[in-house]
């Protein structure tokens, strides 16, 4: 049914999320999400994950720097809104972005291991 | 925000249950009443997997398990004996149960702790 998420996924506001408890590199995380017909988290706004705003973990999200566009892009090619992470100008463009659902974001080496969040839109 | 599915708006769905993820702190009894007013129950834990999931969401929350005193057994809201281990049970002042990062422990029922509500689909 179009309103249901896969088993072990969280449904919230018409989206399904897989919240990993295992740690992976950014690339491993991206492939794991793709294998589940989803993509690494693309945030619409910082309260998108407010159901887990008490979490004190960081999670890989689907943001990477494009040399070609000289911009931070989501996996679908759309640009990062400058209002989402006010500190994004200080991010090292060689790094990937780890996000805490409280609204904090860090740039870390893509080879580092973090938990990750996959997202699927229901409709 | 759009709304889909079988759970109340702003609740989450997980494994055929709906969860209200509270951000406000309440005593155990206040939490019980708050969940009742939402036509649901104070959080119950059915298995290890659910406990792990909820621990990712929030570091601690009340669960619907209590005892009348340290001489009484731990029971669920429907009066059944609660089988799982609850830490610090030897302390006579701690008669309500809390989920705290992958383990269950006793706490003072009058403490202000975050609460979550649940109802099964």
């Amino acid at each position: 049914d179009c309103c249901s998420c896969q088993e072990k996924w969280v449904g919230y506001r018409c989206n399904c999320y897989f919240i990993s408890s295992e740690q992976k590199t950014w690339n491993e995380s991206r492939h794991l999400c793709a294998s589940q017909k989803s993509s690494l988290l693309q945030l619409q706004n910082t309260d998108e994950l407010d159901f887990m705003s008490s979490s004190q973990q960081f999670y890989w999200i689907g943001l990477s720097y494009s040399e070609e566009h000289t911009a931070w892009l989501w996996e679908n090619g759309s640009a990062l809104s400058q209002y989402l992470f006010p500190s994004f100008e200080t991010f090292n463009t060689k790094n990937c972005i780890a996000y805490n659902p409280n609204g904090n974001a860090l740039d870390e080496s893509c080879e580092d291991k973090n938990r990750y969040i996959c997202k699927q839109q229901l409709i | 925000a759009r709304h889909c599915g079988h759970c109340p708006e702003e609740w989450i769905t997980y494994s055929n249950s709906c969860y209200y993820i509270g951000k406000e702190r309440r005593t155990w009894e206040e939490s019980l009443l708050a969940c009742t007013s939402k036509n649901s129950s104070l959080l119950s834990i059915d298995n290890e997997e659910e406990m792990k999931f909820l621990s990712i969401i929030s570091p601690s929350s009340w669960i619907g398990v209590f005892r009348n005193s340290s001489h009484h057994p731990w029971v669920t809201m429907n009066g059944l004996a609660f089988k799982h281990e609850i830490k610090d049970s030897d302390n006579a002042e701690l008669n309500c149960a809390v989920l705290q990062v992958n383990r269950l422990k006793s706490a003072q029922c009058g403490s202000s702790i975050i609460y979550h509500c649940k109802h099964k689909l």
Partner: antibody
């Protein structure tokens, strides 16, 4: 169970060097940020440095920047701190520390500490 | 940098007393706060994380509360082994910082 054992401390003259090591066991070392924290005699706790899981993301306190180098060997479950151009104010007990599994930046486990004394 | 200020810097109390130590952050840190206990010659030990969550193995007489900028550590009934120095620490943003410590002494 989790164990962190530091070694390499000792007495050194100002301007000298020391290399601290920390042997980790009882957990998947490559899954955790690792930290060095120090405590001067009779004083409080001070963050010195930390290193990410792969060793690529590193932080140093301003007081040690350019003089200390943190590194890790995930194959050997070991953390290191190379300390050069040591000063009297670097005298402290140095603790190797591991993050808590739930809260990034909170120290869940500490080593027993190794004393570094910088004196002529 | 976020400054962490503990008060009092020292406190005298007796076995059985209820003791409260406060910690104030110079800016909001949500609930990214930890409390540690340190005894002379020993490494610190984690008591509380996420402002109010009790670390496994820590006695339930220890509790933490607060959010934002103001936090408290409470020991409900002091035991002889609780006389030590207590530190708060923020983990909200780099560089992570500790409070200056509160020494709890026997009256």
């Amino acid at each position: 169970q989790v164990q962190l054992v530091e070694s390499g401390g000792g007495l050194v003259k100002p301007g000298g060097s020391l290399r601290l090591s920390c042997a980790a066991s009882g957990f998947t070392f490559s899954d955790y940020y690792m930290r060095w924290i120090r405590q001067a005699p009779g004083k409080g706790l001070e963050w010195v440095s930390h290193i990410s899981t792969s060793g690529s993301t590193i932080y140093y306190a301003d007081s040690v920047k350019g003089r200390f180098t943190i590194s890790r060997d995930n194959a050997k479950n070991s953390l290191y701190l190379q300390m050069n151009s040591l000063r009297a104010e670097d005298t402290a007990v140095y603790y190797c520390a591991r993050d808590h599994y739930y809260s990034r930046g909170v120290i869940g486990y500490w080593g027993q500490g190794t004393l570094v004394t910088v004196s002529s | 940098d976020i400054q962490m200020t503990q008060s009092p810097s020292s406190v005298s109390a007796s076995v059985g007393d209820r003791v409260t130590i406060t910690c104030r952050a110079s800016q909001g840190i949500s609930s990214w706060l930890a409390w540690y206990q340190q005894k002379p010659g020993k490494a610190p030990k984690l008591l509380i994380y996420a402002a109010s969550s009790l670390q496994s193995g820590v006695p339930s007489r220890f509790s933490g509360s607060g959010s934002g900028t103001d936090f408290t550590l409470t020991i409900s009934s002091l035991q002889p082994e609780d006389f030590a120095t207590y530190y708060c620490q923020q983990a909200n943003s780099f560089p992570y910082t500790f409070g200056q410590g509160t020494k709890l002494e026997i009256k």
